[in-house]
Interface confidence: medium
């Protein structure tokens, strides 16, 4: 399987909410001994490899934000985590895997990485990640929304 990032750039005004998304592509083994570890973290564009450094998102580590479940199963982190830190990670039946960040501030700007690890109890392992940039802009009216785009494309859409 692979991980796709539908959008590589999200531009949002302060105070808005944004949902960053990764998508699991390709065949996913649904065997009883196969599970998936999915998580999010902040990183930097390393010279050698993007996403190799793992930093917390709003003081929550990748361990705090992880989901662990089988195949294309729905899962999400609990609401008390979302309420306390304005974060919620979720995974649906279609391979979409997201983190929602509420009430954005300028400090939320940066590179975000999703990580998916296929666990087969050590008979094999497969690990993939995706990266996307979040730019939070000051002074925009509260009515404006986030824009999501691929940096290389001129097209952009309004993000949910």
């Amino acid at each position: 399987f692979k991980v796709a990032t539908p959008y590589s750039l999200y531009v949002c005004p302060e105070g808005q909410n944004v949902t960053l998304t990764c998508r699991l592509l390709g065949p996913v083994d649904k065997g009883h001994d196969v599970t998936f570890y999915k998580t999010w973290y902040r990183s930097s564009r390393g010279e050698v490899q993007t996403c190799s450094e793992r930093r917390p998102i709003r003081n929550l580590t990748f361990q705090d934000l992880h989901l662990h479940h089988g195949g294309h199963q729905a899962a999400n982190t609990s609401h008390d985590l979302a309420q306390r830190h304005g974060l919620e990670s979720a995974s649906d039946h279609h391979g979409n895997f997201s983190i929602t960040m509420r009430n954005l501030t300028l400090l939320d700007s940066g590179l975000y990485c999703c990580l998916v690890v296929e666990i087969r109890h050590h008979h094999s392992e497969h690990r993939v990640h995706g990266a996307m940039e979040l730019q939070v802009q000051a002074g925009k009216g509260s009515g404006s929304t986030c824009m999501a785009s691929n940096e290389q494309d001129s097209d952009s859409i309004t993000a949910a």
Epitope: A75, H122, E125
Partner: antibody
Framework: EVQLQQSGPELEKPGASVKISCKAS????????MNWVKQNNGKSLEWIGN????????TYNQKFKGKATLTVDKSSSTAYMQLKSLTSEDSAVYYC?????????????WGAGTTVTVSS | DVVMTQTPLSLPVSLGDQASISCRSS???????????LHWYLQKPGQSPKLLIY???NRFSGVPDRFSGSGSGTDFTLKISRVEAEDLGVYFC?????????FGGGTKLEIK
């Protein structure tokens, strides 16, 4: 057979540093976090931290930050822990232990332990 | 850090008896994703710890079914239905819901 082979006992003087090794065999070394655990006098266990051998990413118990440094050599499937500025408090048995499920924190394979003795 | 408190410290039993070890955490071990990362290990004299039970009640492969784990939130129990000689040693509970991972102080299972 999955094994973690640890280096032999160490006798060090106070203030010195020591580097102990843990060689993995029988499985994909980069597939799971490698953890290090300290045991004093055969009593309680303390988690020092872990390292993701794939990325080299480390997570430390705050208590051991500045004391322990975790590294890996992927080419030889070996994890290392360096302990610096040794004192008698560091005399203990140190275990490496593999995470059973990547990074979920339960350890199915343990090394035999390396005894570190700090004495002048 | 999460403090794990095990009781009793020492548990004298007769072979064939049932044994029960309690582990209490200073805060809930329910992870935000709904899982509870509470585990049990057995360390025999002169050996490394061995994983018995993971995530409260899942027996690790090769562990006899006389071992069972239960509990939720902050209170957990390991039961051995019929103690055999090979079960003697020190039992540790451990949590990996919160970093740093922490262990209980151990319960020594010994012959009466």
């Amino acid at each position: 057979e999955v094994q973690l082979q640890q280096s032999g006992p160490e006798l060090e003087k106070p203030g010195a540093s020591v580097k102990i090794s843990c060689k993995a065999s029988g499985y994909s070394f980069t597939g799971s976090n490698m953890n290090w655990v300290k045991q004093n006098n055969g009593k309680s266990l303390e988690w020092i931290g872990n390292i993701d051998p794939y990325y080299g990413y480390t997570t430390y118990n705050q208590k051991f930050k500045g004391k322990a440094t975790l590294t890996v050599d992927k080419s030889s499937s070996t994890a290392y822990m360096q302990l610096k500025s040794l004192t008698s408090e560091d005399s203990a048995v140190y275990y490496c232990a593999r995470d059973y499920d990547y990074a979920l924190g339960y350890f199915d394979v343990w090394g035999a332990g390396t005894t570190v003795t700090v004495s002048s | 850090d999460v403090v794990m408190t095990q009781t009793p410290l020492s548990l004298p039993v007769s072979l064939g008896d049932q044994a029960s070890i309690s582990c209490r955490s200073s805060q809930s071990l329910v992870h935000s994703n709904g899982n509870t990362y509470l585990h049990w290990y057995l360390q025999k004299p002169g050996q490394s710890p061995k994983l018995l039970i993971y995530k409260v009640s899942n027996r690790f492969s090769g562990v006899p079914d006389r071992f069972s784990g239960s509990g939720s939130g902050t209170d957990f129990t390991l039961k051995i239905s019929r103690v055999e000689a090979e079960d003697l040693g020190v039992y540790f509970c451990s949590q990996s819901t919160h970093v740093p991972y922490t262990f209980g102080g151990g319960t020594k299972l010994e012959i009466k």
